[in-house]
């Protein structure tokens, strides 16, 4: 039966019809009207953006466009003391200051309200000490100074290269090593790709350009001061000692011109390797301290930058179902942006804004969707996914009985080379047939299909002829619902060839050069790969909200849950002797994945048989789907971390934009060899074997036949 | 009762190769991740590799990487270790084991010319 079918409408309002309304030059024109001023986060600017898209998704034809507004905690520079950095001589004497602000873009030269560079909640300070240069400031970086180059931090100010990893998380390692401050700086290493001039000439990173961006480490908690609740108009705020999340030490982000000033003085040790060393003319010393002539100067911090607890607005808008208006697919993604936001969001939200106005073309034609979808536009991401966090805190209970799935929107863009998908094994089929239905918009593939040029560029590292499709992290506004909630959740975009730029993330994220022109002149000058990423996103939310059958695969979950199983065992197999010792078995999880994957082949079976004119029992394996991904849910959340309770997958504790499987595992062995008592860090592993063991069992059951 | 039995050990030049058997029963073979473990005279265990389900999920230590290969037959619910480029090293006693509680007794591997 056709996915229409339910709906009663005329054949033409399928997937095709809603498709075929995108158009690109839409998308560049929406992309062009949110990029022309700064939408930092609780800026009237921001509030007047969300006022405008209200107004228009009402007029492209939704039910109903609400504002949903929260008071969180923010923060921002002070506009009369600005931060900088200092090389101080052995009086006290400022011989060198790092720059205040961004040089403008052209044409961007008069416009007012551009933030300066700045870590956001870092506290205020003024410390001043030696430096020690901590490469990317990962775990492993400070086991190597701390363990093998006997290095101490404590005390010290550390300079370390952004990439790899979330810089909360650096944040945080540097604070655990002791350091009294911490310089955050784009290498070009990392930042500017060989053979491509810098901006406006290129997509690369200036020397005066630099990345702003939050230094939380909330672990899912939303507003640092209501974690758990909605930040609402009788909330109980925490006092500011103990909000979630907050850094303890001075923080700020500097360019590599800048960089350039403090690392050529270095003394001290030798980098270790050449992974240490960026492209720089400098050594990469990592110190303590300057070298011989320099060895009297030191490095003075300026932070006096304020948290301050202020208004943010998301915009919820509703298209409700034609049957099951009790069931929500929402499609979100943030509108608050760091400066211009060229890219990070505005390239997601203006396909986000193309989205809503073909549902909305569809429905003022008479077709309803099957099931309600909810379109977001949330705010301020960028200082911890606080809009998307507090919305869904307020809505837990609904969304927990009633939230098929979500599917993110950030920026649609990180390159132009080929698709990047991140999601729920579940998704696994439904991207699978949607990306064979679509076009490819590479050079090479003309008349190819999506699927086509995306498994050649980025094939599966495991099944041939499939491509790459990875887990879910953090770092975005899906987090609440994937790893809190427990909603079937992904995100696609359009990424960089990761083979031949090793650079992390764009060079120009986060900085005042991520303008429309940048997207227009250099990324996507026919907006062809944001047309295509808005085909995959709104094809999904089509599919999510109008196919009779969820198309969701469970076998998807088996195949991946037997993965993980293997890794996870081999990570524990590493230490044999303890393993025998302590006695610990993996018999228990390996058993339940075995059940779940016959459970979930049987109830594949069902699905393949029943009877889909009945729609009591269509309902009820549409909710046995639907329940699945909730079902790995562990109410008590993962140790220490009570926000992230999914079993399966959680941001890494050490990178919080990379996904881990069975992390609860993996967290009770990281660095086990270290631990003061082996028998509670081994006592520690069976009980986390033990709770993955009987979660995986315990989703397998809910696919059971009920009865 | 699970019962893990290993053969194949003996004794090569350096550059030699062996091929380790541990043939498995009590337990559905098919659904355990498999290891190869080993213990070099005077030294404590070191694991050597590991396998999950099939020939796709295979891990190894760094110092075997590219000339040691684990498979695993589960028509015959038995892993192999295909030992190539053999070294002085590598001369140990060689367990399989399900996990810390299900071991075999070993096969020795003595490398020595």
């Known amino acids: 039966k056709s996915s229409n079918e339910a709906t009663n409408i005329t054949p033409k309002h399928n997937m095709k019809a809603f498709l075929d309304e995108l158009k690109a030059e839409n998308i560049k024109k929406f992309l062009y009207n949110f990029t022309q001023i700064p939408h930092l986060a609780g800026t009237e600017q921001n509030f007047q953006l969300a006022k405008q898209i209200q107004s228009q998704w009402k007029e492209f034809g939704l039910d109903s466009v609400e504002l949903a507004h929260y008071d969180v905690l923010l923060s921002y520079p002070n506009k009369t003391h600005p931060n900088y950095i200092s090389i101080i001589n052995e009086d006290g004497n400022e011989i060198f200051n790092t720059s205040l602000f961004e040089p403008p873009p052209p044409g961007y030269e008069n416009v007012s309200d551009i933030v300066p560079p700045f870590s956001a909640f870092s506290p205020q300070g003024m410390p001043e000490g030696d430096l020690v240069y901590v490469n990317y400031a990962r775990t492993e970086d400070f086991f190597k100074l701390e363990r093998d180059m006997k290095i101490n931090c404590s005390g010290k100010i550390v300079i370390a290269r952004y990439g790899k990893v979330f810089r909360g998380n650096k944040v945080k390692n540097a604070q655990l090593a002791g350091a009294k401050g911490v310089i955050l700086y784009s290498d070009p290493a990392d930042y500017f790709a060989p053979g491509v001039k810098s901006y406006p000439d290129g997509w690369n990173l200036p020397g005066g350009g630099v990345q702003r961006g939050n230094i939380l480490n909330l672990n899912g908690a939303g507003d640092p001061l209501t974690p758990g609740y909605p930040a609402n108009e009788y909330a109980y705020r925490r006092g500011i000692a103990e909000a979630v999340g907050l850094p303890s030490i001075p923080v700020h982000p500097i360019g590599y011109y800048d960089a350039q000033k403090l690392l050529e003085k270095m003394g001290g040790s030798a980098p270790p390797d050449s992974s240490w060393r960026g492209s720089l003319k400098v050594p990469y010393n990592v110190g303590p301290g300057f070298t011989g002539n320099f060895s009297t100067q030191k490095v003075k911090m300026h932070i006096h930058s304020t948290n301050e607890v202020t208004r943010i607005y998301n915009v919820i808008g509703t298209l409700r179902g034609a049957v099951e208006p009790d069931r929500y697919v929402i499609l979100g993604g943030h509108r608050d942006s760091w400066v211009f936001g060229g890219i990070d969001p505005q390239s997601g939200a203006a396909v986000v804004h193309e989205i809503v106005r073909s549902f909305g073309t569809l429905k003022k034609e008479g077709w309803r969707p099957r099931r309600t979808i909810l379109f977001a536009s949330w705010d301020a991401e960028e200082f911890g996914l606080l809009g998307s966090t507090e919305w869904a805190e307020e809505n837990s209970r609904l969304l927990q009985e009633r939230g098929v799935a979500y599917i993110n929107a950030d920026s649609s863009i990180e390159g132009n080379y080929t698709l990047r998908v991140d999601c729920t094994p579940l998704m696994y089929s439904l991207v699978h047939n949607l990306t064979k239905e679509l076009k490819s918009p590479d050079e090479g593939f003309e008349g190819k299909s999506l699927y086509e040029s995306w498994t050649k560029k980025s094939p599966s590292p495991e099944f041939s002829g499939m491509p790459r499709i990875s887990k879910l992290g953090s770092g975005n506004d899906f987090e609440v619902f994937f790893q809190r909630l427990g909603i079937a959740s992904g995100r696609a975009r359009y990424t960089k060839n990761w083979e031949t730029n090793k650079f992390s993330g764009y060079p120009l994220y986060h900085s005042v050069y991520e303008t429309y022109e940048l997207v227009e002149k250099f990324y996507d000058p026919m907006f062809k790969y944001h047309l295509t990423v808005a085909q995959v996103r709104g094809g999904m939310v089509f599919e999510l909200a109008n196919s009779i059958v969820l198309p969701f695969d469970c076998r998807d979950y088996a195949v991946v849950l037997r993965k993980y199983a293997d890794k996870i065992y081999s990570i524990s197999m590493k230490h044999p002797q303890e393993m025998k010792t302590y006695s610990v078995s993996f018999d228990s999880l390996f058993s339940a994945v075995k059940n779940f994957t016959e459970i979930a082949s049987k109830f594949s079976e069902r699905l393949q048989d029943f009877d889909k004119s009945n729609p009591i029992v269509l309902r009820m394996m549409n909710d046995q789907l639907m329940f699945l991904e909730r079902a790995f849910i562990d109410p008590l959340g993962l140790p220490d971390r009570p926000f992230y309770r999914h079993v399966i997958y959680a941001p890494s504790s050490h990178n919080k934009y990379a996904g881990e499987s069975f992390p609860g595992i993996y967290d009770a062995l990281f660095d086990i060899e270290s631990k003061v008592d082996p028998s509670k860090a081994w006592g520690e592993v069976k009980r986390q074997i033990y709770v993955a063991a009987f979660t995986v069992q315990a989703a397998a059951e809910t696919l059971s036949e009920v009865a | 009762e699970v019962q893990l039995v290993e053969s194949g050990g003996g004794l090569v030049q350096p550059g030699g190769s062996l091929r380790l058997s541990c043939a498995a029963s009590?337990?559905?073979?098919?659904?355990?991740?498999m290891s190869w473990v080993r213990q070099a005279p005077g030294k404590g265990l070191e694991w050597v590799s590991s396998?999950?389900?099939?020939?796709?999920?295979?891990y190894y230590v760094d110092s075997v990487k590219g000339r040691f290969t684990i498979s695993r037959d589960n028509s015959k619910s038995t892993l192999y270790l295909q030992m190539n480029s053999l070294r002085a090293e590598d001369t140990a006693v060689y367990y399989c084991?399900?996990?810390?509680?299900?071991w075999g007794q070993g096969t020795l591997v003595t490398v020595s010319s």
């Open positions: 396998i999950g389900e099939n020939d796709r999920t295979t």
């Open positions: 009590g337990f559905t073979f098919s659904t355990y991740a």
């Open positions: 084991a399900k996990d810390g509680v299900h």
